[in-house]
């Protein structure tokens, strides 16, 4: 699992756009019944903010125990606090559930900084503001943890929505969403609208604020504007995609596109930042610095450490560039681009200076594990995880933060050749060499 502002602990050869336009994809292709339309009961079912993660209310056990659960597309375990912890207001009490079944098996998940461990079992699970179903799902009851739960975050567990391949202790532990789809008629798809505040929130405001929507089993048209553009899921483990080109204010970074996906590129709601491989990060920061050179910022700001403050309402958004990621399209030699604003990659931080200030952290950081499109990216877009068709869709979010001059965008098609070459093939370990 990732780290470095990777929640919960961690608080990641494009051709130029040509005149030739390919036929654009429309939303008018046949869909399964119930796939599209309105999902009123699920809209606004997420709370939180990008710095501490977005959570959904879930119930576990019989009688139902209500818990807030972090929505994490970068992992695959459903794991909940099951013992007292200083940062938890409540936890799962297995002994009070008549439907709990012990799997008599432990699970240990270490991170770069911190870990959690627990005991595996199954129980009945439902999502009050989700589909009207109850499923028996695997649950890791967290009995011990270090630097996992976040003080004041208001969530008590994590819902890993990625694929079984990265489940712990191994891929035989069926993830929650797989169980949901198998046991019910819910289509194999979910979509996320994460709504960044755009301004600092104090604790009471966070608890009262709406953080976005997780639409389980479908797509809600009210949550986005324009068209949805889809990129293939390269491999079903993380939600892995392929980036084919990166631009800062329209200027191509001009790197071998393999660098953008070294060693992978994933879409991860459990990571705060846009995380980039070292070489890409350095090139991107150099370009962002050049674009915003009328003002200089301390070195620690670009490392995501120091905060920069402006008098309330005077943040000079216009001096910071837009960032565009071109993603492989569904059609051969076709890509599309998603463009984020500084309103997405400068993360508001509250309560550090005076009330007369707006303070921000730079939310793009360096990664040794590939590109991670975290909340910084996702807060600009409505993101559809179409597992059934092995693709991820992006459209401009109806709730993204912008100003009167610029808006986030999803645009295409663009002609891009040899996109398959942009994917990095992680060397497989020859297990036989380990048998010594």
């Amino acid at each position: 699992t990732q780290h470095g502002i990777r929640l919960p602990l961690r608080s990641g050869l494009g051709g130029a756009p040509l005149g030739l336009r390919l036929p654009r994809e429309t939303d008018e292709e046949p869909e399964e019944p119930g796939r599209r339309g309105s999902f009123v009961e699920m809209v606004d079912n997420l709370r939180g903010k990008s710095g501490q993660g977005y959570y959904v209310e879930m119930t576990v056990g019989s009688p139902p125990q209500t818990l807030n659960i972090l929505v994490d597309t970068g992992s695959s375990n459903f794991a909940v606090g099951a013992a007292p912890h200083p940062f938890l207001h409540r936890y799962y009490q297995r002994q009070l559930s008549s439907t709990y079944r012990d799997l008599r098996k432990g699970v240990y998940v270490p991170y770069t900084q911190g870990k959690w461990e627990g005991e595996l079992g199954t129980d009945l699970v439902s999502i009050p503001h989700g589909p009207n179903v109850t499923v028996r799902a695997n649950i890791a009851a967290i009995t011990e943890s270090d630097k996992f739960f976040i003080n004041g975050s208001n969530w008590e567990g994590i819902l890993g929505l990625a694929y079984a391949e990265i489940a712990r202790p191994d891929d035989s532990l069926e993830p929650f969403f797989d169980s949901l789809v198998k046991q019910t008629h819910v289509p194999n798809l979910f979509s996320l609208q994460l709504c960044g505040a755009g301004f600092p929130l104090n604790q009471s405001e966070v608890l009262a604020s709406v953080g976005g929507s997780m639409i389980i089993g479908g797509i809600d048209h009210s949550l986005y504007t324009g068209s949805l553009w889809y990129t293939p899921i390269r491999r079903e483990w993380y939600y892995e995609v392929i980036i084919v080109r990166v631009e800062i204010n329209g200027q191509d970074l001009k790197m071998d596109c393999k660098e953008y996906n070294y060693d992978k590129s994933i879409v991860d709601s459990g990571t705060t930042n846009l995380r980039l491989p070292k070489k890409v990060f350095e090139a991107a920061v150099k370009s962002i610095k050049a674009a915003s050179s009328t003002e200089k910022f301390p070195d620690g700001f670009w490392l995501g450490e120091q905060l920069v403050c402006w008098q309330a309402g005077t943040t000079p958004w216009n001096i910071f560039p837009v960032i565009s990621l071109y993603l492989m399209g569904e059609v051969t030699n076709q890509s599309f681009r998603i463009t984020i604003l500084p309103q997405q990659y400068l993360r508001p931080v509250e309560d550090v200076a005076t009330s007369q200030d707006d303070c921000y952290k730079f939310a793009i950081s360096q990664s040794s594990t590939g590109t991670v499109m975290g909340a910084v990216i996702m807060e600009g877009f409505y993101v559809v995880f179409d597992r059934a068709r092995k693709r991820i869709g992006f459209a401009v979010s109806a709730c993204h933060v912008h100003d009167e001059f610029r808006t986030a965008a999803v645009e295409g098609p663009f002609v891009t050749l040899d996109m398959e070459d942009c994917g990095y093939n992680i060397p497989q370990t020859d297990e036989s060499t380990l048998m010594t």
Epitope: T294, D299, C309
Partner: antibody, heavy 120, light 108 residues
Framework: QLQLQESGPGLVKPSETLSLTCTVS??????????WGWIRQPPGKGLEWIGN???????YYNPSLKSRVTISVDTSKNQFSLKLSSVTAADTAVYYC????????????WGRGTLVTVSS | EIVLTQSPATLSLSPGERATLSCRAS??????LAWFQQKPGQAPRLLIY???NRATGIPARFSGSGSGTDFTLTISSLEPEDFAVYYC??????????FGGGTKVEIK
């Protein structure tokens, strides 16, 4: 060796505008490596940051003083200046100009300071 | 707003003794903290930056430590010229604005 020197009147009347200039010698104010700033210290008290300026003219001010402060730069004269309007006796202080180095984070070089007294 | 509290307000020591000055931040400032020395009638002088790095020309007897909210300036063996007022400043929030109230190191 780079040096900073404050200059300006030592006495200002209440409600008037305090004006000080800092002259940079032994180096260029147009260096992209530094911001330039003003800090003050009332007699017998601690340090108070007033504001910073970059050679391009980009400024940052202390929110508590912002409505009264203007900092400007004149690269041709290798100088930057402070204006503080509507002064009162509470503005009596030693005023220092300083260089903000080490990745634009630390005041690593200071002028000797000049005492400005606000009195009628 | 981040508040820096220095203690003690006054430290009375003799030359050759070890001085330990404390600076506590009201919330974490990571390692973005500086220490300054100010002698009577003079401008402050940067001693330590990034909590533990000595500035150019600062003697080795001065050392800084700490991160987060608790920081210490240590003068291993006081020289006569070290008797002065010492200020800490956080630069975690930029532009750097917050200074501590100061600790006076005086001759006992």
């Amino acid at each position: 060796q780079l040096q900073l020197q404050e200059s300006g009147p030592g006495l200002v009347k209440p409600s008037e505008t305090l004006s000080l200039t800092c002259t940079v010698s032994g180096g260029s104010i147009s260096s992209s490596s530094y911001y330039w700033g003003w800090i003050r210290q009332p007699p017998g008290k601690g340090l108070e940051w007033i504001g910073n300026i970059y050679y391009s003219g980009s400024t940052y001010y202390n929110p508590s003083l912002k409505s009264r402060v203007t900092i400007s730069v004149d690269t041709s004269k290798n100088q930057f200046s402070l204006k503080l309007s509507s002064v009162t006796a509470a503005d009596t202080a030693v005023y220092y100009c300083a260089r903000l180095g080490h990745g634009y984070s630390y005041f690593d070089l200071w002028g000797r300071g000049t005492l400005v007294t606000v009195s009628s | 707003e981040i508040v820096l509290t220095q203690s003690p307000a006054t430290l009375s020591l003799s030359p050759g003794e070890r001085a330990t000055l404390s600076c506590r931040a009201s919330q974490s400032v990571s390692s973005y903290l500086a220490w300054f020395q100010q002698k009577p009638g003079q401008a402050p002088r940067l001693l330590i930056y990034d909590a533990s790095n000595r500035a150019t020309g600062i003697p080795a007897r001065f050392s800084g430590s700490g991160s987060g909210t608790d920081f210490t300036l240590t003068i291993s063996s006081l020289e006569p010229e070290d008797f002065a007022v010492y200020y800490c400043q956080q630069v975690y929030v930029w532009p750097p604005r917050t200074f501590g109230g100061g600790t006076k190191v005086e001759i006992k």
